[in-house]
Amino acid sequence: IPVIEPSVPELVVKPGATVTLRCVGNGSVEWDGPPSPHWTLYSDGSSSILSTNNATFQNTGTYRCTEPGDPLGGSAAIHLYVKDPARPWNVLAQEVVVFEDQDALLPCLLTDPVLEAGVSLVRVRGRPLMRHTNYSFSPWHGFTIHRAKFIQSQDYQCSALMGGRKVMSISIRLKVQKVIPGPPALTLVPAELVRIRGEAAQIVCSASSVDVNFDVFLQHNNTKLAIPQQSDFHNNRYQKVLTLNLDQVDFQHAGNYSCVASNVQGKHSTSMFFRVVESAYLNLSSEQNLIQEVTVGEGLNLKVMVEAYPGLQGFNWTYLGPFSDHQPEPKLANATTKDTYRHTFTLSLPRLKPSEAGRYSFLARNPGGWRALTFELTLRYPPEVSVIWTFINGSGTLLCAASGYPQPNVTWLQCSGHTDRCDEAQVLQVWDDPYPEVLSQEPFHKVTVQSLLTVETLEHNQTYECRAHNSVGSGSWAFIPISAGAHTHPPDEFLFTP
């Protein structure tokens, strides 16, 4: 640690005195202190001399000697008082700038330590301090206002009692800056804009911050626009608003608009796109396939995306048949607005019944005209099967009818014994019918197919089963020949139709 001579913490001298402060260290040493006049510095290897031959009250202050090469960063200090009976204060600053909740040091240094008992801090023109001002005093450093607030940004003076009268220092302006959490907050309205050529438009860019020192501008395709700024202060925030008014838009007004605000903390920007169109438009689309297949009893949501300008004047869902003249219940139709010009319309069809298959159309209208988007809904059914015994061209034939959607495939099984359903162990013979005859195939209906199995002689201790399957499920019908005729067994699950 460097050593200062004279080796006293404080030195009191009179104006005009010669002061010589010597600092010695192991390596090179440096003096530092307030920017006061008349000092001369002389360095000589490991010592440095700070001297003046005409001390004034302005030399009052703390002088510190450091050894730059010392890894521990040790320093020594001496405080000099230049005791001027006419000047009790040496003010080191015209202005003090701090952030809110920091301590604000007002650097009026007392030139005579004896005066410490009679010091006080006042606002200029003798006004008292604001309520709740918490401050302390150090003769070496001055007055400290603790946890300074924005409202305490004032002009202050230091007061000392000299011979029974108060002597004021020159004033110090305290600026307490609000802590700026980041760049200004921004809004750009609207987020998207569409106008027909010739219409009027307005774009508003606004920024706000706790501190007045920030800039905001609006740019169009990277060109800064010259727009008059409106300023305001409310809710403890400064607001700056730029409003672009266009009476008759044209194609050159289209493009990207950016609202940019910046302060010492950085920059924020937000953008929007302005589209200028020749005429009104209305576009309908769906992310879904327009041809839908759903299993009976399940639910389906039909969704249509609408892009339109100007806004919609009307819209509705319509059932176009073929089964009934029922119309979708309004409570099942739902509309959500994605943004100003894009909307999603949903029709919910829960627990679909056979009569609800068919065409559903969404219709919308705006000044650009009508548009429609139609979905075709086909229901899927598991096969239903029935078998009868008949004679065709004199031959005994088993006739299997299977009805379902998609079109069922048919397989015949012959198995031993009498059973409702052939299992693997009993199967004697299997016939696949790759091309059953299609009896009916209308849009939105089940497909009915027929398969024939010619049987020369019915074996009485055997069962003939017709099985049909599609992507939804399977169905079967067991035919058991008995002496008194034929007996058929539909499987249990087809005895009850929900």
């Epitope: 530092d32 920017p35 006049p37 000092w39 510095l41 600053a93 202005e95 650097p107």
Partner: antibody
Framework: QVQLQESGPGLVKPSETLSLTCTVS????????WSWIRQPAGKGLEWIGR???????NYNPSLKSRVTMSVDTSKNQFSLKLSSVTAADTAVYYC???????????WGQGTLVTVSS | QSVLTQPPSASGTPGQRVTISCSGS????????VNWYQQLPGTAPKLLIY???QRPSGVPDRFSGSKSGTSASLAISGLQSEDEADYYC???????????FGGGTKLTVL
């Protein structure tokens, strides 16, 4: 080794506020005075003002009404704001450490600020 | 208009001694010490002399400073081509509690 680095916009519009920040590295900002000095192209140096780490400031009287300096010891930074700028404020702006004896021992490399619309 | 007055230019040949003057008033040079800065083209100024005649470490002893009354001078002996630069004097000015500079002297090494 103490190093200083000025940062801020290189272009400012007339009547707007010029804002610069000086970041100190290689040493602490504390317990020193820090100054801003400017130099118009082809001209001499002009002292703008100084700030101590406690926030105490002194400004050149010719600029005092337009200048605000502040310090952020937590970031080892100090800053300059010059309001209502005109073309006459176009210059290279330097930040520097000021020592007892009123000399500047460390300087930033300088940043050119142009005032133009 | 600079507060301290310096000649706008000075020149010398390699090996020569050159002196640059700086004159002020009682509120600056008259009552405070003088500092000198060297500014090479395109760079920041560099401290050359402080407290009238003190050289920071790294500055060659070819550079020396002196002060008398309200004037000061910088002397460069054994002039070298790398000394070609602008030189500024500076001092505290009591009337503004700040630093004032000279207008600068452009030194050309012929």
């Amino acid at each position: 080794q103490v190093q200083l680095q000025e940062s801020g916009p290189g272009l400012v519009k007339p009547s707007e506020t010029l804002s610069l920040t000086c970041t100190v590295s290689g040493g602490s900002i504390s317990s020193y005075y820090w100054s801003w000095i400017r130099q118009p192209a082809g001209k001499g140096l002009e002292w703008i003002g100084r700030i101590y780490t406690s926030g105490s400031t002194n400004y050149n009287p010719s600029l005092k009404s337009r200048v605000t300096m502040s310090v952020d010891t937590s970031k080892n930074q100090f800053s300059l704001k010059l309001s209502s700028v005109t073309a006459a404020d176009t210059a290279v702006y330097y930040c520097a450490r000021e020592r007892l004896g009123m000399f500047f021992d460390y300087w930033g490399q300088g940043t050119l600020v142009t005032v133009s619309s | 208009q600079s507060v301290l007055t310096q000649p706008p230019s000075a020149s010398g040949t390699p090996g020569q001694r050159v002196t640059i003057s700086c004159s002020g008033s009682s509120s600056n040079i008259g009552s405070n010490t003088v500092n000198w800065y060297q500014q090479l083209p395109g760079t920041a100024p560099k401290l050359l002399i402080y407290s009238n005649n003190q050289r920071p470490s790294g500055v060659p002893d070819r550079f020396s400073g002196s002060k008398s009354g309200t004037s000061a001078s910088l002397a460069i002996s054994g002039l070298q081509s790398e000394d070609e630069a602008d030189y500024y004097c500076a001092a505290r000015d009591d009337s503004l509690n700040g630093v004032v500079f000279g207008g600068g002297t452009k030194l050309t090494v012929l």
